[in-house]
């Protein structure tokens, strides 16, 4: 009837609403966002769709071409003047590829009730989607009430007559989903109870979270969980040359979006990242750490020839110390102490110097004193020995002084100021010093120990001995006191510059108590211990020279 | 004090094989890129190959690549070049050099040089 | 590969006065604020001999009469007051990408 606005005007040919329809339709119909993946689009079939219809008479397929010949598959129905109308389109089996969710966005048109004049009564605005789980691609003969409603599709948008006449379309799309789905696959349905409806296209989708690289770390296209509220936590691998202290980990939402991004993974050492991916490190620079972000140039005096990596190489006389971290210069022991000067009091000595020209570009210098006791005839040094002490001490210092105290008095002592740093003992070299030649001041001398009895006679007594073992300077003579046996507080005193004396005018046979001691110009030592020797009776010989104990 | 000096140099026939050493003093030989550079007489220098201290990288001038093989035996302080394959135009002198270790890097140190000479 | 490119492929100059010899690259030699360029002197039937690193460092043991500058991908040594010993072949080298190329060699000659 004419009512219809030409849908039926011929047998198999599509109504000029259909035409102008498709012409608008194929100027909208974009590609699919990459988080969608098409289990079904009608639009991209190219040949037979495969769907089937019952009754027969009810929807249609409207065979039309696009701009390229493809054909474009649209059904339609529109028996709205006809009562208890109940028209299925059933799809061909749809594979879920393991998705638990999908989509179907319908592109359709529907005709204004309204506007079509007596068919009021039985004219619908709406049609059904239904859908039916299998596992059989051919498990189509089922009958309705197997099927499960998705929805009632109304149109957002239906036209009229004059719509028509101004060759203006009015698209409608409509998006549902349903889930959970547990079969490898389903069918859908569309129910047209009365209405006047094209319907353009079908896209069957369900959503994934698309591969993605994030922080170094691959997530795998990932599809989307069955709940609308769902995140899926999603592991994901670093990249080549990259390492993780905490698995990268993100979660996928339900609309196909990644989220909540936890842990992350970073280019190993000698690598760095460049454009999502760890590249190496280049000769000439190095990368520690994984926590480092980038290569970074080799320190000073230090290279490296190779590709990744994670230390360079120190040059030719130059040293790093296990504790150095790898980002520091390479260094070297210091250049000697400067200007070093010399302060003698009595047996002590202080030394003062200035720092090395060169620290070997460490702050870690400080100064070791060596000491040599030097005999000036022979030329020949010996260590000085424990007895010396040093303040603040001898190794290790600090600063740029030292005091030497319990030094031998008028002794030559040459002492060797190093400088050393944190790799002085990594460097093979020479040690690096500044000497100081100093003299101790004279003291008084330490007392005579070996004294010889030479000839003894009934008046006299002759003596000698050795100069003190600890001179402390230049003996200018020797004073001999001596005294008759308990008879201390009369004493005699003899003085002589030589290392003989003989006492005169003593009382035969009678013990006489000798004590020597010496004088420099710091003054006199102390005396010696009491030797005692006896003179001859008046009628004995003279005795032999002996060593007294 | 660093020297470099290269051996094994001669006349070989074309499609014929030779292999080039140079022997390294002075210096840590292990932490050093070698490279071989060579000079076709009356010409001017050509890069042909360079090969990491550790021998972990290892690079070639495409005029050589197939042919050459650069190899190190950082044991006995010495670079190889085993050359297969000889055309007349591998004809040259032939140098090793040292990369140098002040950045960015240039061959500081060179041999003398070992001249091959490829003909019939 | 870099193609490098020297210019002029010969000059003279009187001693004491100043030579100055380009090279140009096909591409830029530059890396993180570096330029990896080589400048290098060979005199007949010796081996090359390092002048100048980085487009412009002075190599130790050379006068610093030769000088270097330039970046990207031109590159320029001079000499300031030429020496009767400066007469020899003058080559630059990229050391920025694999393989290593070397210009064709500048010839200078003392007038």
């Known amino acids: 009837p004419a009512s219809l606005a030409g849908c039926y005007s011929a047998p198999r040919r599509a109504p000029l609403w259909t035409c102008l329809l498709l012409c608008a339709a194929l100027r909208t119909l974009l590609a699919s966002p990459s988080n969608e993946v098409n289990l079904l689009d009608s639009r991209t079939v190219m040949g037979d769709l495969g769907w089937i219809a019952f009754p027969k008479n009810g929807w249609e397929e409207i065979g039309e071409v696009d701009e390229n010949y493809a054909p474009i598959h649209t059904y339609q129905v529109c028996k709205v003047m006809e009562q208890n109308q109940n028209n299925w389109l059933l799809t061909s089996w749809i594979s879920n590829e393991g998705a638990s969710r999908i989509f179907i966005e319908l592109k359709f048109t529907l005709r204004d009730c309204n506007s079509l004049p007596g068919g009021l009564g039985t004219c619908k605005e709406t049609f059904n989607m239904y859908y039916f789980e299998s596992d059989d691609q051919n498990g189509r003969n089922i009958k309705e009430n197997q099927y499960i409603k998705i929805d009632t599709i109304a149109a957002d948008e239906s036209f009229t007559e004059l719509d028509l006449g101004d060759r203006v379309m009015k698209l409608n799309t409509e998006v549902r989903d349903v889930g959970p789905l547990s079969k490898k696959g389903f069918y859908l349905a569309f129910q047209d109870v009365g209405a006047c409806i094209a319907l353009v296209s079908v896209r069957v989708y369900y959503k994934k979270c698309p591969s993605v690289v994030r922080h170094l770390a691959v997530f795998p296209d990932t599809i989307t969980g069955a709940d609308s509220s769902q995140l899926l936590e999603v592991s994901g691998s670093c990249v080549n040359h990259s390492v993780t202290d905490e698995p990268p980990k993100m979660h996928c939402s339900a609309e196909g979006e990644w989220l909540v991004p936890i842990g992350k993974c970073m280019c190993k050492a000698g690598y760095e990242e460049k454009n999502g991916t760890c590249q190496v490190c280049r000769p000439g620079f190095f990368k520690a750490s994984p926590h480092i972000q980038s290569c970074g140039k080799c320190p000073p005096h230090s290279y490296t020839h190779e590709e990744a990596s994670t230390s360079c190489v120190c040059e030719k006389d130059y040293f790093r110390r296990e504790s150095d971290p790898p980002t520091m210069a390479c260094t070297r022991p210091p250049s000697a102490p400067r200007n070093a000067i010399s302060n003698v009091n009595e047996t002590s000595v202080f030394l003062e110097w200035i720092p090395p020209a060169d620290t070997g570009g460490r702050k870690d210098v400080s100064y070791y004193i060596a000491c040599k006791k030097c005999n000036s005839h022979a030329g020949v040094c010996e260590e000085c020995g424990g007895h010396v002490r040093y303040l603040p001490r001898q190794s290790g210092l600090k600063n740029t002084s030292v005091m030497m105290v319990d030094l031998l008095a008028h002794t030559n002592y040459t002492f060797e100021i190093e400088a050393v740093n944190g790799v002085s003992d990594l460097s093979p070299g020479a040690r690096q010093y500044v000497s100081v030649n100093v003299t101790t001041n004279q003291a008084a001398p330490s007392p005579v120990t070996n004294v010889k009895k030479g000839k003894i006679a009934k008046n006299s007594i002759s003596l000698s001995w050795q100069e003190p073992d600890r001179p402390n300077g230049i003996i200018l003579e020797y004073e001999i006191k001596y005294f008759e046996k308990d008879q201390e507080t009369s004493y005699t005193i003899i003085k002589s510059k030589e290392t003989t004396i003989t006492a005169e005018g003593l009382k035969p046979a009678s013990v006489y108590v000798f004590q020597i001691r010496a004088r420099t110009a710091a003054g006199y030592g102390v005396f010696s211990r009491r030797f005692e020797f006896e003179t001859t009776p008046v009628f004995a010989a003279s005795s032999d020279q002996s060593q007294i104990p | 004090e660093v020297q470099l000096v290269e051996s094994g140099g001669g006349l070989v026939q074309p499609g014929g094989s030779l292999k080039l050493s140079c022997a390294a003093s002075?210096?840590?030989?292990?932490?050093?890129?070698i490279h071989w550079v060579r000079q076709a007489p009356g010409k001017g220098l050509e890069w042909v190959a360079s090969?990491?201290?550790?021998?972990?990288?290892?690079y070639y001038a495409d005029s050589v690549k197939g042919r050459f093989t650069i190899s190190r035996d950082n044991s006995k302080n010495t670079l190889y070049l085993q050359m297969n394959s000889l055309r007349a135009e591998d004809t040259a002198v032939y140098y090793c050099?040292?990369?140098?270790?002040?950045?960015?890097?240039?061959?500081?140190?060179w041999g003398q040089g070992t001249l091959v000479t490829v003909s019939s | 590969d870099i193609v490098m490119t020297q210019s002029p492929d010969s000059l003279a100059v009187s001693l004491g006065e100043r030579a100055t010899i380009n090279c140009k690259s096909s591409?830029?030699?530059?890396?993180?604020?570096?330029?990896?360029m080589n400048w290098y002197q060979q005199k007949p039937g010796k081996a090359p001999k390092l002048l100048i690193y980085?487009?412009?460092n002075l190599e130790s043991g050379i006068p610093d009469r030769f000088s270097g500058s330039g970046s990207g991908t031109d590159f320029t040594l001079t000499i300031s007051r030429l020496e009767p010993e400066d007469a020899a072949v003058y080559y630059c080298?990229?050391?920025?990408?694999?393989?290593?190329?070397f210009g064709q060699g500048t010839k200078l000659e003392i007038k």
């Open positions: 050099a040292r990369y140098g270790t002040s950045f960015p890097y240039g061959l500081d140190y």
């Open positions: 002075g210096f840590t030989f292990s932490t050093f890129g």
């Open positions: 090969i990491s201290g550790a021998s972990t990288t290892i």
């Open positions: 591409q830029s030699v530059d890396y993180d604020g570096d330029s990896y």
């Open positions: 980085g487009a412009s």
């Open positions: 080298q990229q050391s920025n990408e694999d393989p290593f190329t």
